[in-house]
Interface confidence: low
């Protein structure tokens, strides 16, 4: 009587992750009676992966009836493969038996999970960083195989060099992970500049996986101030102007003082946005000159999204005319009684 | 027998918290994942959480932050520790087991019944 | 998160019909798929598992089929305990969800 083999043809077998795998096993007699088993691994660890006497096993199915008492062909099909399902496979011959005994296996299938990267997540810094300073951006994509990748950094569609990638682990494994860091330099025309991560695999049939960030969630731009004074119509009174131009983000608190002194505080609101992405914004006082004092200094003190505070101090110019439209008797406060005292636009 | 049973149900404040136990016989609680599903009075079925034979968990979004499943093997016991409970959490709790190979629910507890109002 | 849809939400039937209820996946779930029964007041009950696996001590007059979105259970030949609510469930991936349940009532 010929001694019984079972033949497992392919050395090895390669598929994509979410796809089915066929595995051959065919066996040259199927005396003794007895079970076909299929494992993962060798050894007293491994994993059934198919019964064909019990069990539920809803993943793999018999490529043919093995019911049927002629058919020799055990071969199985896994639906549905994962990077996890990667391994080594084995057909076993068991005699029938309590316990049923292991008689012949076949020389094994390495299974390979060729398995799509998730989509690359990209995370900035925590904190603001102002123009010309440089900031880290992270790229991460999980889950791919084998392990082979290409990672590329873009800012505005220019590829980026000076970035630092990994993929782990280092050996081998059903998967694997990639990071990567890029260094940006920052301008001030960057608030409306994007970070790409691009990532290319087998696995994407040349249809790389892109991952976005903005540098407007990255960059603060410092306001610049200016303080300017005009005549109004009323020949007592001035206007007073801070320009607060080119900040970013939009959070912003100004302070008027006079002579040191808090005069009053405003939230910017009704901001014009300039073509980069920054903000302009102006607040003004009406000042009444009959009331003024000799040396009158008058602060806009500005507070950029929780920053310390920049200001620009402006010393009140009252002509002799408007001196001499005073009477000697005036007094009262440096800032004309309107309501409000100030105004923005 | 399999057999799986709840208790710690009851009546509780919004805002309150309460713990559910589950109790299980006849086989090892730990080499099965384990879930808790509920359902409000008059409404369906909701998968709430569950733990795996790792120790992972997973929860549904409404649960989030608020519920932690977990598990005392030495108990063969499940746990389902719910806080801030809110009257929308209001049901009957029950105890799943899921089957080895696919974590196919297969044994279910009788239920307990959690209400939660002011 | 993947949403099940049964239908019919109720349906009438007598004792001995064969009725028919559907169940579809808002997205692809191989054959992931299980029916429960459930009576007023009693847990629900496992009948099928993976789409057309009956459970242990499931009658087999308990049939399911499917495969991707759609799916069936089918109740060969009613009798007066068939009549409860019967629920689908998906459980490729968390979170697991269960179709709003299919009321079979006595005509």
């Known amino acids: 009587e010929e001694e019984l083999q079972v033949i497992q043809p392919e050395k090895s077998v390669s598929v994509t992750a979410g796809e089915s795998a066929t595995l051959n096993c065919t066996v040259t007699s199927l005396i003794p009676v007895g079970p076909i088993q299929w494992f993962r691994g060798a050894g007293p660890g491994r994993e059934l992966i198919y019964n064909l006497k019990e069990g539920h096993f809803p993943r793999v199915t018999t490529v043919l009836d093995p019911t049927k008492r002629n058919n020799m062909d055990f071969s199985i099909h896994i639906s549905n493969i994962t990077p996890a399902d990667a391994g080594t496979y084995y057909c076993v011959k068991f005699r029938k038996g309590s316990p049923d005994v292991e008689l012949k296996s076949g020389a094994g299938t390495e299974l390979s999970v060729r398995a799509k990267p998730s989509a690359p997540v990209v995370s900035g810094p925590t904190a603001r960083a102002t123009p010309e300073h440089t900031v880290s951006f992270t790229c991460e994509s999980h889950g791919f195989s084998p392990r082979d990748i290409t990672l590329k950094w873009f800012k505005n569609g220019n590829e980026l060099s000076d970035f630092q990638t990994n993929v782990d682990p280092a050996g081998k494994s059903v998967s694997y992970s990639i990071r990567s860091t890029a260094r940006v330099v920052l301008t001030r025309r960057d608030v409306h500049s994007q970070v790409i991560c691009e990532v290319a695999h087998v696995t994407l049939q040349g249809d790389p996986l892109r991952g976005t960030a903005n540098l407007s969630e990255a960059i603060r731009v410092p306001p610049t101030l200016e303080v300017f004074q005009r005549p109004m119509r009323a020949e007592n009174q001035v206007n007073v102007t801070c320009q607060v131009r080119k900040f970013y983000p939009q959070r912003l608190l100004l302070t008027w003082l006079e002579n040191g002194n808090v005069s009053q505080t405003e939230t910017a609101s009704t901001l014009t946005e300039n073509k980069d992405g920054t903000y302009n914004w102006r607040s003004w006082l009406l000042v009444n000159t009959c009331a003024h004092r000799d040396g009158v200094v008058l602060t806009c003190q500005v507070e950029h999204d929780g920053q310390p505070a920049v200001s620009k101090s402006h010393a009140l110019e009252v002509s002799a005319h408007q001196k001499e439209q005073c009477s000697d008797t005036t007094s009262g406060p440096v800032l004309a009684p309107t309501a409000p005292l100030g105004g923005s636009g | 027998e399999v057999q799986l049973v709840e208790s710690g149900g009851g009546l509780v404040q919004p805002g309150g918290s309460l713990r559910l136990s589950c109790a299980a016989s006849?086989?090892?609680?730990?080499?099965?994942?384990m879930h808790w599903v509920r359902q409000a009075p008059g409404k369906g079925l909701e998968w709430v959480s569950a733990?795996?034979?790792?120790?992972?968990?997973y929860y549904t979004g409404s649960v989030k932050g608020r519920f932690t499943i977990s598990r005392e093997n030495a108990k063969n016991s499940l746990y389902l520790q719910m806080n801030s409970l809110r009257a929308g959490d209001t049901a009957v709790y029950y105890c799943?087991?899921?089957?080895?190979?696919?974590?196919?629910?297969?044994?279910w507890g009788q239920g307990t019944m959690v209400t939660v109002s002011s | 998160d993947i949403q099940m849809t049964q239908s019919p939400s109720s349906l009438s039937a007598s004792v001995g019909d064969r009725v028919t209820i559907t169940c579809r996946a808002s997205?692809?779930?191989?054959?992931?798929l299980a029916w429960f029964q459930q009576k007023p007041g009693k847990a629900p009950k496992s009948l099928i598992y993976?789409?057309?696996s009956l459970h242990s001590g499931v009658p087999s007059k308990f049939s399911g089929s499917g495969s991707g979105t759609d799916f069936t259970l089918t109740i060969s030949s009613l009798q007066p305990e068939d009549f409860a609510t019967y629920y689908c469930?998906?459980?490729?991936?968390?979170?697991?969800?269960f179709g709003q349940g299919t009321k079979l009532e006595i005509k």
């Open positions: 733990i795996g034979t790792a120790g992972d968990t």
């Open positions: 997205q692809d779930i191989n054959n992931y």
């Open positions: 006849g086989f090892t609680l730990s080499s099965y994942d």
């Open positions: 799943v087991r899921g089957g080895v190979w696919d974590d196919a629910f297969d044994i």
């Open positions: 993976t789409a057309s």
């Open positions: 469930q998906q459980y490729v991936s968390y979170p697991y969800t």
